[in-house]
Amino acid sequence: LKGQEFAPSHQQVYAPLRADGDKPRAHLTVVRQTPTQHFKNQFPALHWEHELGLAFTKNRMNYTNKFLLIPESGDYFIYSQVTFRGMTSECSEIRQAGRPNKPDSITVVITKVTDSYPEPTQLLMGTKSVCEVGSNWFQPIYLGAMFSLQEGDKLMVNVSDISLVDYTKEDKTFFGAFLL
Amino acid sequence: LKGQEFAPSHQQVYAPLRADGDKPRAHLTVVRQTPTQHFKNQFPALHWEHELGLAFTKNRMNYTNKFLLIPESGDYFIYSQVTFRGMTSECSEIRQAGRPNKPDSITVVITKVTDSYPEPTQLLMGTKSVCEVGSNWFQPIYLGAMFSLQEGDKLMVNVSDISLVDYTKEDKTFFGAFLL
Amino acid sequence: LKGQEFAPSHQQVYAPLRADGDKPRAHLTVVRQTPTQHFKNQFPALHWEHELGLAFTKNRMNYTNKFLLIPESGDYFIYSQVTFRGMTSECSEIRQAGRPNKPDSITVVITKVTDSYPEPTQLLMGTKSVCEVGSNWFQPIYLGAMFSLQEGDKLMVNVSDISLVDYTKEDKTFFGAFLL
């Protein structure tokens, strides 16, 4: 057991210790998306590469069918970047034509699905109006934060429009999580 | 040795333990860049402050000549933000003049150089079209993710145009990594 | 004490160990902001939800009056996202009217207050010119990095204009920190 002479007064001396290299971790990278059916009011989920190139899963963190599966309860840092690219959305022309003054937008959501709750929980959202003039456009949305997850929870990344996702490079669009 | 009575069933009881305060860590902050020669098809690398102000390196994580040097194999969280600023890129004027419909852009790449591979590996990329109208512009690109690195690997941050990097404040442009 | 036969040669064998679940951590989420008095040259600070929904504080990390209170010295990863939304800032019209060519902007600053320094320290800044055409706009600014903090330090998130912050959803605007 840890020598108490080294324990700060606030330390829970009997708390279980763990080797850091043993913690569940994953970094997933983008693949070309195959069109999938999704509910009208729900953004489609991306699927991912989990073992080639920079991608990996380890220590019982598994990837299956668009989901990262949480193998152990605890606090996780979860992150994702999605790079979008598209043709110009000419907002000024839209406005002049008398159509609604609502911009086009791009959105990324990291979602948790849990057995104990009927609805998915949106953990993180990055949403941006896209009102470019004059050219094709491209830009990333990055998200990352810490959440308390339960064993058996599933994580996915949803996007507003799968056809705008840049799937060309593993460093542009990715998704990861690790137990703290 | 840790008492097994406290070990969760999935714990590798004999894995080496480590004090968190002993792990390699670095947070580097921007400095004014001196123009350096770089290959035509390779983005130039930024150099960094490593000990003044908010910047630090510790526990054998060293900085030298634009590179963070990885002293120990393991999974690292790596992050960077680069704030860019520039004069207007009038995409609509460019387009009217009949020039190609390719927007100007800003790009940040976190790159790994490793002994075991002849080419640098792009770990993370943030790239954004810049097609502003009407004024000077400024904006950050943030990146962060987890990667498995080997002892002796070197990390750098490359940008598409060093002259657009905002080097005025240590909180605007930075680069860091820490062993998980 | 840890068995030395498992200790890598660089490990400080007598360094104190700590259970990860015992470390100070917090994830705070946005709430509707009440206008507060602030000094003319200082951006207003956001206040936060600390216990409902996705928000939590644990292991002596406390939230009070806009501040996260650091209970223990060490290296922390600190992050925030603020989603802004507003009506169009017609920069081109501003320019035509002969007014200064300074764009509107949105800024997020994560600030440290410490009793060993009379001024707040800006740890992280994300700042972006906003020069949209044709519509309402919305966009996030994300920040995250590692800093060495002292027991008793206080962290807050300041923004350039509190009225532009999207407070509608806990996944859009948030603030967190955890001891590494």
Epitope: - | - | Q37, F39, N62, T64, N65, K66, F67, L69, V113, T114, D115, S116, Y117, P118, E119, P120, G152, K154
Partner: antibody
Framework: QVQLQESGPGLVRPSQTLSLTCTVS????????MHWVRQRPGRGLEWMGR????????KYNPSLKSRVTITRDTSKNQVSLRLSSVTAADTAVYYC?????????WGQGSLVTVSS | DIQMTQSPSSLSASVGDRVTITCRAS?????MYWYQQKPGKAPKLLIY???NLASGVPSRFSGSGSGTDFTFTISSLQPEDIATYYC?????????FGQGTKVEIK
């Protein structure tokens, strides 16, 4: 504008407890840290301790720790100092000081004499 | 405790002279502060973080140094600068002040 006003009895009997209050205005003291510093006649400055008004956390000068207590009442914008078991050596001007978060600012000081 | 040794304890200089006060810490500190105290008044912060001029302080005051050795300078002494000057470290517990340097006009 910013004000820090120390108040309390100017005379305290030996072995009694010295009590002073600092009332602040013009800023939110929870954005800062509040310190007490004293200056004995013809002597230099001595830091006594500080409180974080946001959390109530305190730090004290170890040489005074057994005798000093600093508290705050944020609803009244007040910070208080108590120094127990005083002797003539505690005769001093006592200053309330704001620091951290906002520029340093000192009260004008309160002279306390310990005498029977 | 971190001991602050300030020198000289007093000095006399003419108007317009350059005045230098030194402060040595018994161990390295990151931040050093310099205060001015006029008779019957509270101290006033002049320099923070070793070299930053506090708001409203004339530019003839400056500070420098790092680690254990710090210097405070008045580039051109003015009559209103007659005061006692203190260094202080604001980090270790307890915070400690130098014993003061009394500056007088010749």
């Amino acid at each position: 504008q910013v004000q820090l006003q120390e108040s309390g009895p100017g005379l305290v009997r030996p072995s009694q407890t010295l009590s002073l209050t600092c009332t602040v205005s013009g800023f939110d003291m929870q954005d800062t840290y509040m310190h007490w510093v004293r200056q004995r006649p013809g002597r230099g400055l001595e830091w006594m301790g500080r409180i974080d008004p946001a959390s109530g956390h305190t730090k004290y000068n170890p040489s005074l720790k057994s005798r000093v207590t600093i508290t705050r009442d944020t609803s009244k914008n007040q910070v208080s100092l108590r120094l127990s078991s005083v002797t003539a050596a505690d005769t001093a001007v006592y200053y309330c000081v704001r620091s951290g978060g906002l520029p340093d600012y000192w009260g004008q000081g309160s002279l306390v004499t310990v005498s029977s | 405790d971190i001991q602050m040794t300030q020198s000289p304890s007093s000095l006399s200089a003419s108007v317009g002279d350059r005045v230098t006060i030194t402060c040595r810490a018994s161990q390295g500190v990151e931040y050093m502060y310099w205060y001015q105290q006029k008779p019957g008044k509270a101290p006033k912060l002049l320099i923070y973080g070793a070299s930053n001029l506090a708001s409203g302080v004339p530019s003839r005051f400056s500070g420098s140094g790092s680690g254990t050795d710090f210097t405070f300078t008045i580039s051109s002494l003015q009559p209103e600068d007659i005061a006692t000057y203190y260094c202080q470290q604001w980090e270790g517990n307890p915070r400690t002040f130098g014993q003061g340097t009394k500056v007088e006009i010749k």
